[in-house]
Interface confidence: low
């Protein structure tokens, strides 16, 4: 096939072909592809024509949507919304070829990469060592340090045995679960609810990519469609990152977890997962944030609190 | 990474054909526009023409009566040949990597091969 | 075709120093422009494209703006490994064409 100019000056912008490799099927644009892409900050104004002689792509709303990259989407993406809620404010205005930027608001400070919400810095009664950043939290003086390393010991010990209990809970329920269901003696997996309610404040972000690396795709865009995330953001992360499957399952559950919010993300994981028969699945991810909260408190901080109040 | 590596006769009499090959290496071949551009000595650049791996061309109007590019995707090989040569073709000749055939993005010429002279002499 | 006109033709100028080269089309081609650097005797290296984006592992030192028919390639901080010509080329509508380039010479 050739395309050409006639001597008409004719502008040949986009030459259209349909799909005949197989591994091409994820770049795949309404059964047709264009040549040329939008350029960032415009989207197609309509579908691939063979000699398209009007402009084809026409501006995003300025303020409202952006694309930050050359697109062969009909769509601009919506700007992001900086929730007061979240701790977040706006950094830089979205333009049309730009994200919004959000920052933490004064008080409020981010410890992970990508914040999708901000948690209000500590107040301290007995003065500050530290003061609140927007990426740490406030470190404040204690009085009677050595009384609190006391009581600290009192609250952490209990820890293993909590945990041991639960595991032991956990897998009566899950056995009973797949005897029920499937009448077999495989590995015991777990309730996810027993679990949830006592782990249902943990901070789900720091989780994220750990939960994507066991879960995949098609377990991924389920449980993301069934708990708020609509198609049309599915596909927009799936567009960003067509030949990346890891991300997109990073971004899915980020997205996720950013319109659900901190609170209760957890609980709502397992039960999804659990609603999902999904049981081995929330098992796995249960016993990964339950190792790294013992480990956590068992170790760094009892330790890190040692070396500072003795 | 993606390497191009071109070849083709150096030295033509007028009214000869020009013919090069350039090879890729690494990358994807199947989704860009692969484009030729050539340099006479001490001037700029001119467009000359691009494929993709499906044998869909784009020829620059000044040269489409002589030039033919073609694809061999079991070599990831792009050819140029330039019929009726004349001094005036006497030029640097180098391979592209051109704008995504598909998928998102655009990233100008951004892989260039390392360019092959070609002398039009009686 | 689609005429490019890059200016200054050549300038000169001193290590530190901030760089601006112009580049006008004959008609409007949107943010479909690239700047390339081509040193003597080297293939010619992509800088910038879709007007104003970095190629990947260019020295930020590097912008490009401009939409439409203007386009404006700087260079914040002059470095001595960037004296070399400059062209700037539009991909909106074929065939493609390079402007005549610019030549930045130390001073």
């Known amino acids: 096939q050739v395309t050409d100019i006639n001597s008409k000056g004719l502008e040949l912008r986009k030459t259209v072909t349909t799909v005949e490799t197989q591994n091409l099927e994820d770049l795949h644009h309404d059964g047709q592809f264009c040549h040329k892409p939008c350029p960032p900050g415009e989207r197609k104004a309509r579908d691939c024509t063979v000699n398209g002689d009007e402009p084809d792509c026409v501006p995003c709303q300025e303020g409202k949507e952006y694309t930050d990259k050359a697109h062969f989407s009909s769509k601009c993406r919506r700007c992001r919304l900086c929730d007061e809620g979240h701790g977040l404010e706006v950094e830089i205005n979205c333009t049309r070829t730009q994200n919004t930027k959000c920052r933490c608001k004064p008080n409020f400070f981010c410890n992970s990469t990508v914040c999708e919400h901000c948690d209000p810095c500590t107040k301290c009664e007995h003065g500050i060592i530290k003061e609140c950043t927007l990426a740490s939290n406030t470190k404040c003086k204690e009085e009677g340090s050595r009384s609190n390393l006391w009581w600290l010991c009192l609250l952490l010990l209990p820890i293993p045995l909590i945990v041991w209990v639960k595991r032991k809970e956990v897998q009566k329920t899950c056995r009973k679960h797949r005897k029920e269901n499937q009448g077999s003696h495989e590995s015991p997996t777990l309730n996810p609810e027993t679990v949830a309610i006592n782990l249902s404040d943990v901070d789900l972000s720091k989780y994220i990519t750990t939960i994507a690396g066991v879960m995949t795709l098609s377990q991924v865009k389920g449980f993301v469609r069934k708990n708020g995330v609509n198609e049309a953001k599915i596909d927009e992360i799936k567009n960003d990152n067509v030949q990346d499957t890891a991300e997109q399952k990073v971004q899915l559950l980020r997205n996720w977890h950013q319109l659900h919010g901190k609170k209760d993300a957890y609980d709502t994981l397992i039960k999804g997962l659990k609603k999902a028969n999904l049981c081995t699945l929330a098992e796995k991810i249960q016993t990964i944030i339950l190792k790294d909260i013992t480990s956590d408190s068992e170790n760094s901080n009892f330790r890190n609190e040692i070396q500072s109040l003795v | 990474q993606v390497q191009l590596q071109q070849w083709g006769a150096g030295l033509l009499k007028p009214s000869e054909t020009l013919s090069l090959i350039c090879a890729v290496y690494?990358?994807?071949?199947?989704?860009?526009?692969w484009t030729w551009i050539r340099q006479p000595p001490g001037k700029g650049l001119e467009w000359i023409g691009e494929i993709n791996h499906r044998g869909t061309t784009n020829y620059s109007p000044s040269l489409k009566s002589r030039v033919t590019i073609s694809v061999d995707t079991s070599k990831n090989h792009i050819s140029l040949n330039l019929t009726s040569v004349t001094a005036a073709d006497t030029a640097l000749y180098y391979c592209?990597?051109?704008?995504?055939?598909?998928?998102?993005?655009?990233?100008?010429?951004?892989?260039w091969g390392q360019g092959t002279t070609v002398t039009v002499s009686s | 075709d689609i005429q490019m006109t890059q200016s200054p033709s050549s300038l000169s100028a001193s290590v530190g120093d901030r760089v601006t080269i112009t580049c006008r089309a004959s008609q409007g081609i949107r943010r479909w422009l690239a700047w390339y650097q081509q040193k003597p005797e080297k293939a010619p290296k992509s800088l910038i494209y879709?007007?104003?984006s970095l190629q990947s592992g260019v020295p930020s030192r590097f912008s490009g703006s401009g939409s439409g028919t203007d386009f404006t390639l700087t260079i914040s901080s002059l470095q001595p490994e960037d004296f070399a010509t400059y062209y700037c080329?539009?991909?909106?509508?074929?065939?493609?064409?390079f402007g005549q380039g610019t030549k930045l010479e130390i001073k």
């Open positions: 879709a007007a104003s």
């Open positions: 690494g990358g994807s071949f199947s989704t860009y526009y």
């Open positions: 080329q539009q991909y909106n509508s074929y065939p493609y064409t």
């Open positions: 592209a990597r051109g704008l995504l055939w598909i998928g998102e993005g655009d990233y100008g010429l951004d892989v």
